[in-house]
Amino acid sequence: IVLRPSRVHNSEENTMRALTLKDILNGTFSYKTFFPNWISGQEYLHQSADNNIVLYNIETGQSYTILSNRTMKSVNASNYGLSPDRQFVYLESDYSKLWRYSYTATYYIYDLSNGEFVRGNELPRPIQYLCWSPVGSKLAYVYQNNIYLKQRPGDPPFQITFNGRENKIFNGIPDWVYEEEMLATKYALWWSPNGKFLAYAEFNDTDIPVIAYSYYGDEQYPRTINIPYPKAGAKNPVVRIFIIDTTYPAYVGPQEVPVPAMIASSDYYFSWLTWVTDERVCLQWLKRVQNVSVLSICDFREDWQTWDCPKTQEHIEESRTGWAGGFFVSTPVFSYDAISYYKIFSDKDGYKHIHYIKDTVENAIQITSGKWEAINIFRVTQDSLFYSSNEFEEYPGRRNIYRISIGSYPPSKKCVTCHLRKERCQYYTASFSDYAKYYALVCYGPGIPISTLHDGRTDQEIKILEENKELENALKNIQLPKEEIKKLEVDEITLWYKMILPPQFDRSKKYPLLIQVYGGPCSQSVRSVFAVNWISYLASKEGMVIALVDGRGTAFQGDKLLYAVYRKLGVYEVEDQITAVRKFIEMGFIDEKRIAIWGWSYGGYVSSLALASGTGLFKCGIAVAPVSSWEYYASVYTERFMGLPTKDDNLEHYKNSTVMARAEYFRNVDYLLIHGTADDNVHFQNSAQIAKALVNAQVDFQAMWYSDQNHGLSGLSTNHLYTHMTHFLKQCFSLSD
């Protein structure tokens, strides 16, 4: 059980206040984290509160400003990047968001040696992506879907690709579906470790069907936004990987890296690229039916001036019970011999663990094991491997950092974080300097987040980087809800849940219950993290009990739970939320006439299906930007879990799992349907089809659209959204305004 430290004593009660909706919308109780921008083994950059860029040397204890806020302000810079030779800084301004990760910006190069901006051969604008080489000060950038190279910032650019075309050919940047569902980055180019080679992806979207929606703006006529967006079963992008020698780019030009034969024989994806050395690269490929992944290690053949990918260096990862990997196929972390690597994949018991691959995957040596999961490999040095897992005390929603000594035999394991600030910190991530000389730990909760700096050899804490003192002080007179994390055992399934309870919670009383659900494959909602958000307010001020439940399909508890939803989305996720609600009712403090469910995106899909389950459990519910049919969602994501919407594959379940098919069942619930009209991700089409089905079934419901808003419903829409949902829930629960 995680109980927030209670500071409530009867004598103090009058000075304590509940959270308000305004607190949440204003971000009054938001926290800060500190991630050092490492530039060497012992140095990092950080943007100070007054916007100076400061270089810190851990060993000397000295710090100095390398770039003043005045210089930053002169071009309205919101971001920066120091060249590895420390001679130049790029300054980023005119940030213009595109999709989840992508944006365009204007870039200025500042010469630190003379304190002036580089004039002559300035960069074009707007640029889609720009980065320094890992050594020196070469620049690679993407402009109008083509890649350019500069040997020095003041040099004229060398154009690497010429076929880039808006919405057709993307070089060095992903198209929509690769950005959102495969790479999770705004870039698709990778420098080799010493900057000799530049690898890049080319995405050909010529044959992809286009999603078109209106953007209303302020003009007399709305604009139409067109995005090549492959929905389930549609034509996919065609990807090719090229590598160019950046020292002599014109000599042989870009060389294509071959796709493994077993992948090339049918539709496939490229999933990631990892440089091993300057002359060895590792590519990961995935069949369109995403249960087979191939990791291919390719070598530069000097005599051929091409990349050779021998069959002996092809490593196959196949899932027989679900899809390959977790959300994504894991990426390898290479050891110092530049051929063997560490990788997370399922062991024979169906838990994701670290394996060491020296020759073949079949002969992999398992490094971690147990009925828990290794989650991320942070760093491999010559004598240590740092990773995170949820092993400690058997709480799947925790993250601790471990060190395994790989230099000694047998390897010994040490938990670096488990006992540091045990009550406050149970969910960590880490950021390592070169050679793991030092590292920062960022603790996200359950207490107030704190970031600390540590010695990579001894694990000794050196200093606190950010402890959120102001937040701690601000919360001193706030009646925060209590939180507990527990589990239910139902029919051999473990359902972990987080319950958020009103500050003066009394088990003998009855409370309205709100279920907050996401429930998507490989997600996790029950996490030991700090948050003061809308549901905190609902518990604190409005006296609701809020519960989050991780059911079948969720992550980090083994493949049995994870792959239970394979090819059957919309069934067990909903069942498990319903099962949990029944168990909560049995606990005795839930008013069973006042139960609601809400979710966003995948959660909107699950909440809609739960409301339409015909159980009579839910009085009302909200779906924000829900998927309504898997035929409407992106191929890469959907097919990973559902297969193809074809007669000979899984069309039947595609049809059976729609929200529209259950329109009749909404008759006895209050349903609030919300969607942004400019949602590039879960298209407004999804809610339009729900609404149409409800109207056709003559079922009353409430709806709200947000004009020109995307999947995030940001800005003023956020305030409107949460205010609107609050009114809806209070009305549903008969709570006075």
């Epitope: 090339a264 024989s265 990918c309 021998p310 069959k311």
Partner: antibody
Amino acid sequence: DVQLVESGGGVVRPGESLTLSCAASGFTFSNYDMGWVRQAPGEGLEWVSGIRGRGGSTYYADSVKGRFTISRDSSKNTLYLQMNSLRAEDTAVYYCAKENNRHSFFEYWGLGTLVTVSS
Amino acid sequence: EIVLTQSPGTLSLSPGERATLSCRASQSVGHYLAWYQQKPGQAPRLLIYDASNRAIDIPDRFSGSGSGTEFTLTISRLEPEDFAVYYCQQYYNNWPPLTFGGGTKVEIK
């Protein structure tokens, strides 16, 4: 020494089936990709089918796709080619061949077995 | 599929002479080309792989060259045992179908 010995050839009528076997020795059979290559009387070489050592992926020439099935039994160090719906144009000497471990050229070949399809 | 065209179809030479055999690919196969020798009633035997690398136990009078679409097998001085049929094979990216050329017969003049 690497040895590949084919067997199972013979005379069959069009539409009938035949299974060829290839007994392998002198190398770790399960680690290597294997293939079948045929040669019609007085003609050149034609690749028929291949199978991966790891992963077991199978590949076929268009001329035999849907009719022939390649398989392997690593416990017996044996490669097979199941040939159904045989046609006159399938008449050939069938060679079993071991691919190089890095690339798909054939380092070692068996002596071949003759398949004759005739009415 | 990639088509390999070998020329000439037949090459009539005397022992001691130099033989030059050509193999042309319908599209680039990089360096992924092998040469085989086949004598009557025997199985093919690997001579050259990766366009220019000699296989084990192959005498150095055999050499291969070329890349992309044009390849050559050269036998510097023909020995009596070299009279046979020679085939080229591409294995570009190890992708099936693997294809062979039609063969060049080197016969005694």
